[in-house]
């Protein structure tokens, strides 16, 4: 069962991580979530510029997900369909991040409570039954030399390259891959 993240890192407003969100769920092919230039969202077998994402804490346990290359926010319609938007609508583009005990994460629309899924090969209207939450493994992305895409809600906090900007996690404590540098 997913457990809400209680990491002190998420208490630190504006914490920014660059990650690839990888899924290997049985009902999916192995893929990295990518936000494309035209605003479509899909899966890529390999890591790509479109799949490098910036995860930013908006408040404890809630994040926004931005495609670094396309400068588009990951958003979800009330029917669960995903899209990449140039405009950050907090009600469509905020996700609750839940950590699983095996290091994977699940993401839910904060507004609708719907789980984040990569679009399947079949039309979502033809799915025989509702799927459970997709599990994503956040793989670290190298900090790019590029400037931060415009319009992020708050300035970057100091020491964003650190997975422990407030020095609150001791070396002996376990960490989710979501926060691995």
């Amino acid at each position: 069962h997913p457990i809400p993240d209680s990491s002190p890192l998420l208490q630190f407003g504006g914490q920014v991580r660059q990650r690839y969100l990888y899924t290997d769920d049985a009902q999916q092919t192995e893929a990295h979530l990518e936000i494309r230039e035209d605003g479509t969202v899909g899966g890529a077998a390999d890591q790509s510029p479109e799949s490098l994402l910036q995860l930013k804490a908006l408040k404890p346990g809630v994040i926004q997900i931005l495609g670094v290359k396309t400068s588009r926010f990951l958003c979800q319609r009330p029917d669960g369909a995903l899209y990449g938007s140039l405009h950050f609508d907090p009600e469509a583009c905020s996700f609750r991040e839940l950590l699983l005990e095996d290091g994977y994460n699940v993401y839910q629309s904060e507004a609708h409570g719907l789980p984040l899924h990569l679009p399947g090969n079949k039309s979502p209207h033809r799915d025989p039954a509702p799927r459970g939450p997709a599990r994503f493994l956040p793989l670290p992305g190298l900090p790019p030399a590029l400037p931060e895409p415009p319009g992020i809600l708050a300035p970057q906090p100091p020491d964003v390259g650190s997975s422990d900007p407030l020095s609150m996690v001791g070396p002996s404590q376990g960490r989710s891959p979501s926060y691995a540098s």
Epitope: G39, S71, R77, L86, H87, F88, P90, E91, A92
Partner: antibody, heavy 119, light 110 residues
Framework: EVKLVESGGDLVKPGGSLKLSCAAS????????MSWVRQTPDKRLEWVAT????????YYPDSVKGRFTISRDNAKNTLYLQMSSLRSEDTAMYYC????????????WGTGTTVTVSS | QIVLTQSPAIMSAPLGERVTMTCTAS???????LHWYQQKPGSSPKVWIY???NLASGVPTRFSGSGSGTSYSLTISSMEAEDAATYYC???????????FGGGTKVEIK
């Protein structure tokens, strides 16, 4: 057919109030950000207000901030604009417009309703 | 606040002529955030070109858009009677969210 139909426009005195409505049909209203845009008598277009999909976030230009309030009722598929402390420069054709999901330009416009502020 | 200035304000062109109008921003605008609308008398504006270069559904291929930074343009390769209208450029600014329009270019048939 995707359709937006505005209503509520009228002749009102300076300092008065007015509430505009926009009835949406043919699409899932709650999935889209919505705005009001006005066109002045000299044909200039001016953005007036924007509201998020769920209605919890609103945005205004300085020219109307504190005087106009945008709201929506997703159950009724209706967008509203409450206007108060109206001025002569608010005289315009008011359009309700839907935002494109991914690029946020105005992809669907209503037919407009006329607001005239005059003594 | 970014200001969009369109020129010329009014232009006349004979049928078949190439027509170009410009939209100049007071500071740099991302090409993803620059759009164009067409409006005919008595009608509502219609999105015509989005994200600088992409033609909206149903827009004839004689129309094209280009530009970057502070300078953008809309071109009609061969003017037709149905193209007589006013064209507005439009910009979205992400933070804080604002939407700005140019003053419009009215295209008439000579």
């Amino acid at each position: 057919e995707v359709k937006l139909v505005e209503s509520g426009g009228d002749l009102v005195k300076p300092g008065g109030s007015l509430k505009l409505s926009c009835a949406a049909s043919g699409f899932t209203f709650s999935s889209y950000g919505m705005s009001w845009v006005r066109q002045t008598p000299d044909k200039r277009l001016e953005w007036v207000a924007t509201i998020s999909t769920g209605g919890g976030y609103t945005y205004y230009p300085d020219s109307v901030k504190g005087r106009f309030t945008i709201s929506r009722d997703n159950a009724k598929n209706t967008l509203y604009l409450q206007m108060s402390s109206l001025r002569s420069e608010d005289t315009a054709m008011y359009y309700c417009a839907r935002h494109d999901l991914v690029d946020w330009y105005f992809d669907v416009w209503g037919t407009g309703t006329t607001v005239t502020v005059s003594s | 606040q970014i200001v969009l200035t369109q020129s010329p304000a009014i232009m006349s062109a004979p049928l078949g002529e190439r027509v170009t109008m410009t939209c100049t921003a007071s500071s740099s605008v991302s090409s993803s955030y620059l759009h164009w609308y067409q409006q005919k008398p008595g009608s509502s504006p219609k999105v015509w070109i989005y994200r600088t270069t992409n033609l909206a559904s149903g827009v004839p291929t004689r129309f094209s858009g280009s530009g970057s930074g502070t300078s953008y343009s809309l071109t009609i390769s061969s003017m037709e009677a149905e193209d007589a209208a006013t064209y507005y450029c439009h910009q979205y600014h992400r933070s804080p969210p604002t939407w700005t329009f140019g003053g419009g270019t009215k295209v008439e048939i000579k």
